[in-house]
Interface confidence: low
C-alpha cells in the first residue's frame, strides 16, 4: 500500500455489516483483505467486489476497487486483497507518461518509416526512419534483407510510447 | 514484471567466436524489437545491433559482418552470433527491449576476448 | 558518425542543491535519451524521447534540449541520485558521474 492515502482511494465508510468478518489485530496491524476497526480492536473485512487491502495494514477503511473504463477490458476482478486488473482495448495502448486514458494505435508507420513494434496494451507501433536497402513498401523486409547503417544514422523512433 | 536473463559470456581467444542468449519473460516479446548494447570497462554504452519483431535487422558499424542477431519468438530468446573476436570487443552485453529506446535491460554477461 | 560529448565527466553536489549535466550532439539530433547507472548495475531507462521521463523516476528529473544541446536536471539533489548518467541516441556519450557531498 502505497502511505499517501487519499480520501478519494478510500471506500465510502460503512459500519461493519453482521456478516462482515472480524479478527483481532496482530501488533496493532490487520492482514490483506481486511481494515482495522475504529476503537483498533478488530480486523474487519473487505466486501467483495468492492473494495480491497493488499498488505498488512492499519487502515480505518478498505480502498475502494477500481472500475475499469470504457474502451478498457477487464482481465481480473476487485478481490478482499487485488484491485481489478484492467488493460486497454485491442488496437489502442496507454502511453507511460498519460496513464489516465487508453489511446488509438497509430495504423502505420509515417512515409519514409517502418514499424518495428507492434501496437500493444502497453506500447503505440514503433516506427523508425527507413535506410537504404530496405523495401520501400511500409513493410518490415524479408529476412535477408539488412539495414546497412552506421550509429551516425540512426533509425529515430517516432514512436510515442517509450 | 519484464525479464531480460543473458547468458553465453566467457573467456574467448582472438578470432574465436561466442553466441549470447538473452532470455525474455513478462511481456509479449514477439511484438517487440530487441537491442543488443556493450559497455567495455570504464566505459560508456555502445549499441551493437537491433532486430524488428520481423525480421529487420541493424547492426554497428564495428561489429558489421562479423556478428548476427536473430531471435525465436517460440522461445522468447534473442541471439547474437560473434564471430572474428578482437580484443576491442571485450565488454559486458546486455540485451535491451526496444530497437533504441531501450525501457528494459538485463544484468549482462562478460564477454572477455584475449590470449 | 554523430559524437555525443558529455560534461563535466565527475561532479558533487550537496542534498538540496539543483544539477545540471549537458549532452552535446557532433550534429544535429531530433531526440535524446538518458540512462542512469549505478556501480555494478545495469543501466535504467531515466528520460526518453528528450524530455519524457520514464516510470519510477523521481519528478524532480527533466530534460530538455534540440539540435546539437540536451541536458539532464535534477531540481533537488538527493543521496540516492549518485550516479554515472548516459545521454544515448545509438552509442552514448562518455557519461557524468554525480557523486553526493
Known amino acids: 500500500e502505497s502511505a499517501l492515502i487519499t480520501q478519494q482511494d478510500l471506500a465510502p465508510q460503512q459500519r461493519a455489516a453482521p456478516q462482515q468478518k472480524r479478527s483481532s489485530p496482530s501488533e496493532g496491524l490487520c492482514p490483506p483483505g481486511h481494515h482495522i476497526s475504529e476503537d483498533g480492536r478488530d480486523c474487519i473485512s473487505c466486501k467483495y467486489g468492492q473494495d480491497y487491502s493488499t498488505h498488512w495494514n492499519d487502515l480505518l477503511f478498505c480502498l475502494r476497487c477500481t472500475r475499469c473504463d470504457s474502451g478498457e477490458v477487464e482481465l481480473s476482478p476487485c478481490t478482499t486483497t487485488r484491485n481489478t486488473v484492467c488493460q486497454c482495448e485491442e488496437g489502442t495502448f496507454r502511453e507511460e507518461d498519460s496513464p489516465e486514458m487508453c489511446r488509438k494505435c497509430r495504423t502505420g508507420c509515417p512515409r519514409g518509416m517502418v514499424k518495428v513494434g507492434d501496437c500493444t496494451p502497453w506500447s503505440d507501433i514503433e516506427c523508425v526512419h527507413k535506410e537504404s536497402g530496405t523495401k520501400h513498401s511500409g513493410e518490415v523486409p524479408a529476412v535477408e534483407e539488412t539495414v546497412t547503417s552506421s550509429p551516425g544514422t540512426p533509425a529515430s523512433p517516432c514512436s510515442l510510447s517509450g | 514484471e519484464v525479464q531480460l536473463l543473458e547468458s553465453g559470456g566467457g573467456l574467448v581467444q582472438p578470432g574465436g567466436s561466442l553466441k549470447l542468449s538473452c532470455a525474455a519473460s513478462?511481456?509479449?516479446?514477439?511484438?517487440?524489437?530487441m537491442s543488443w548494447v556493450r559497455q567495455a570497462p570504464g566505459k560508456g554504452l555502445e549499441w551493437v545491433s537491433s532486430?524488428?519483431?520481423?525480421?529487420?535487422?541493424q547492426y554497428a558499424d564495428s561489429v558489421k559482418g562479423r556478428f548476427t542477431i536473430s531471435r525465436d519468438n517460440s522461445k522468447n530468446t534473442l541471439y547474437l552470433q560473434m564471430n572474428s573476436l578482437r580484443a576491442e570487443d571485450t565488454a559486458v552485453y546486455y540485451c535491451?527491449?526496444?530497437?533504441?529506446?531501450?525501457?528494459?535491460w538485463g544484468q549482462g554477461t562478460l564477454v572477455i576476448v584475449s590470449s | 558518425d554523430i559524437q555525443l560529448t558529455q560534461s563535466p565527466a565527475i561532479m558533487s553536489a550537496s542534498p538540496g542543491e539543483k544539477v545540471t549535466m549537458t549532452c552535446r550532439a557532433s550534429?544535429?539530433?531530433?531526440?535524446m535519451n538518458w540512462y542512469q547507472q549505478k556501480s555494478g548495475t545495469s543501466p535504467k531507462r531515466w528520460i526518453y524521447d528528450t524530455s519524457k521521463v520514464a516510470s519510477g523516476v523521481p519528478y524532480r528529473f527533466s530534460g530538455s534540449g534540440s539540435g546539437t544541446s540536451y541536458s539532464l536536471t535534477i531540481s533537488s539533489m538527493e543521496a540516492e541520485d549518485a550516479a554515472t548518467y548516459y545521454c544515448?541516441?545509438?552509442?552514448s556519450g562518455q557519461g557524468t558521474k554525480l557523486e553526493i557531498k
Open positions: 535491451a527491449k526496444r530497437w533504441n529506446r531501450f525501457d528494459y
Open positions: 513478462g511481456f509479449t516479446f514477439s511484438s517487440y524489437a
Open positions: 544515448q541516441q545509438w552509442s
Open positions: 532486430i524488428a519483431n520481423g525480421k529487420m535487422t
Open positions: 550534429s544535429s539530433v531530433s531526440y
